[in-house]
């Protein structure tokens, strides 16, 4: 499973993080590192 199951009490959303510190700055300048719906937001 790539995400939490609905039946486990977790509501599934689609969120992608810049997880590795070394990737910060190479992802469109995102410093917060939250990508929602394909758009990096701060």
């Amino acid at each position: 499973d790539a995400e939490f199951r609905h039946d486990s009490g977790y509501e599934v959303h689609h969120q992608k993080l810049v997880f590795f510190a070394e990737d910060v700055g190479s992802n469109k300048g995102a410093i917060i590192g939250l990508m929602v719906g394909g758009v990096v937001i701060a």
Epitope: A2, E3, H14, Q15, K16, L17, V18, F19, F20, A21, E22, D23, V24, S26, N27, K28, I31, G33, M35, G38
Partner: antibody, heavy 112, light 112 residues
Framework: EVQLVESGGGLVQPGGSLKLSCAAS????????MSWVRQTPDKRLELVAS????????YYPDSVKGRFTISRDNAKNTLYLQMSSLKSEDTAMYYC?????WGQGSTLTVSS | DVVMTQTPLSLPVSLGDQASISCRSS???????????LHWYLQKPGQSPKLLIY???SRFSGVPDRFSGSGSGTDFTLKISRVEAEDLGVYFC?????????FGGGTKLEIK
């Protein structure tokens, strides 16, 4: 929906080779570093290879250096792990991971 | 490599109790941008690890607010305010500030 789906695991004899693949979807694959992490029978997690977003930089621990090669095809949204000179201690569940998401895992058993 | 040390190894709890897991790193996890890349996963039997908390205290999408993370520098804690049956499994801390990505040895949360 972010998905990482591994394939290619199996039973291999010591000294043999195997290539794992990981098909990614639901995110801009080419923007993210990716890794292969293995979970040994004692349940410990160990990074075995990582690669940056454009494939220009890789990392391997000493335990697999010279035997494992990580690569990626950003046009195909696919991550690979070529393993050779396999040893019994490489027996593990191998996960493709972006850190926040992990695949379901692919089992490698090295045994004669 | 950064060594991640988790305690306890096993944590027996009663449902409804609070649980607390400690994670210490062998060096500071503060990155040059001021962020601290310390994360917590839960792995249930037969599943891959799932991200719960990222960057010390941010809950990943869909994670209940009974999970909370705290700490700084080299000393971190995961708290579960009221343990439910679905929370049982093995918890891992992890750092991605430094290369290579490293993991704690795991803490098994089980019923007392």
């Amino acid at each position: 929906e972010v998905q990482l789906v591994e394939s290619g695991g199996g039973l291999v004899q010591p000294g043999g080779s195997l290539k794992l693949s990981c098909a990614a979807s639901g995110f801009t694959f080419s923007s993210y570093g990716m890794s292969w992490v293995r979970q040994t029978p004692d349940k410990r997690l160990e990074l075995v290879a990582s690669i940056n977003s454009n494939g220009g930089s890789t990392y391997y621990p000493d335990s697999v250096k010279g035997r494992f090669t990580i690569s990626r095809d950003n046009a195909k949204n696919t991550l690979y792990l070529q393993m050779s000179s396999l040893k019994s201690e490489d027996t593990a569940m191998y996960y493709c991971a972006s850190g926040d998401y992990w695949g379901q895992g692919s089992t490698l058993t090295v045994s004669s | 490599d950064v060594v991640m040390t988790q305690t306890p190894l096993s944590l027996p709890v009663s449902l409804g109790d609070q649980a607390s897991i400690s994670c210490r790193s062998s060096q500071s996890l503060v990155y040059s941008n001021g962020d601290t890349y310390l994360h917590w996963y839960l792995q249930k039997p037969g599943q891959s690890p799932k991200l719960l908390i990222y960057k010390v205290s941010s809950r990943f999408s869909g994670v209940p607010d009974r999970f909370s993370g705290s700490g700084s520098g080299t000393d971190f804690t995961l708290k579960i305010s009221r343990v439910e049956a679905e929370d049982l499994g093995v918890y891992f801390c992890s750092q991605s500030t430094h290369v290579p990505w490293t993991f704690g040895g795991g803490t098994k949360l089980e019923i007392k």
